[in-house]
């Protein structure tokens, strides 16, 4: 039995920040779980982890180069990514594992979310306004 995951197909980070919501077909309330966010088509780079259990505060881990926070809903984990760089534009996959109570469960691979990080383009003001017409 696998947990199903829904993600937005695409998100645009205009201000170098984005909220990526991972919605699960499973209620995480009073469960011990590990939710993670993976970068790249092969999910090779794990960039954020949210660990939760019934007795402790939510714990959030960010890989060096990523600034991550996490929020828990009954059937969702939202990853808040800040200070993103243009070169971090990629596809990101949500993963979930539930360890307790048994049985161990994980998810079917989701379709992922393309996060497009838009660079901040400042409008150039002309240094020289040019000759004024009489």
């Amino acid at each position: 039995n696998k947990i199903l995951v829904k993600q937005s197909p695409m998100l645009v980070a205009y201000d170098n920040a984005v909220n990526l919501s991972c919605k699960y077909s499973y209620n995480l309330f009073s469960r011990e779980f590990r939710a993670s966010l993976h970068k790249g088509l092969d999910s090779a780079v794990e960039v954020c982890v949210v660990y939760g259990n019934y007795s402790q505060q939510l714990q959030v881990y960010s890989k060096t180069g990523f600034n991550c926070d996490g929020k828990l809903g009954n059937e969702s984990v939202t990853f808040y990514l800040q200070n993103l760089y243009v070169n971090q534009t990629d596809i990101y996959f949500c993963k979930i594992e539930v360890m307790y109570p048994p049985p161990y469960l994980d998810n079917e691979k989701s379709n992922g979310t393309i996060i497009h990080v838009k660079g901040k383009h400042l409008c150039p003001s002309p240094l020289f306004p040019g000759p004024s017409k009489p």
């Epitope: 590990r34 993670s36 794990e46 982890v49 660990y51 714990q59 890989k63 360890m99």
Partner: nanobody
Framework: EVQLVESGGGEVQPGGSLRLSCAAS????????MGWFRQAPGKEREFVAA????????DYAESVKGRFTISRDNAKNTVYLEMNSLRAEDTAVYYC?????????????????WGQGTLVTVKP
């Protein structure tokens, strides 16, 4: 809940070698990392080395690069620290740590569980 048990500490002469082991037990996820930190008397606990479950990410403190090697046996849930060319300044209590992060984190705050520590003494 994760339990960590270290072994392998002892006294050795400068230039000598030791191998530390740390066995983890409890509920494990598909990825996590384990690391070694050390604490000399009167000093802060400092990062030594770390490795993740997939063994595709390892990191070392500059002071031990080329002398120490971290490895792990996933079947035994055990991580090892091979220490060669030991120096007097390596004398410390060595602690094994466990983190739910899936990379070789050098940040002490990322580690959720700690072993009891094993003493390494390097002296002539």
């Amino acid at each position: 809940e994760v339990q960590l048990v270290e072994s392998g500490g002892g006294e050795v002469q400068p230039g000598g070698s030791l191998r530390l082991s740390c066995a983890a037990s409890g509920r494990m996820f598909s990825n996590y990392a384990m690391g070694w930190f050390r604490q000399a008397p009167g000093k802060e606990r400092e990062f030594v080395a770390a490795i993740n479950y997939r063994r595709d990410d390892a990191d070392y403190a500059e002071s031990v690069k080329g002398r120490f090697t971290i490895s792990r046996d996933n079947a035994k849930n055990t991580v090892y620290l091979e220490m060669n060319s030991l120096r007097a300044e390596d004398t410390a209590v060595y602690y094994c740590g466990f983190t739910y992060a899936g990379w070789a984190s050098s940040r002490r705050d990322d580690y959720n569980y700690w072993g009891q520590g094993t003493l390494v003494t390097v002296k002539p």
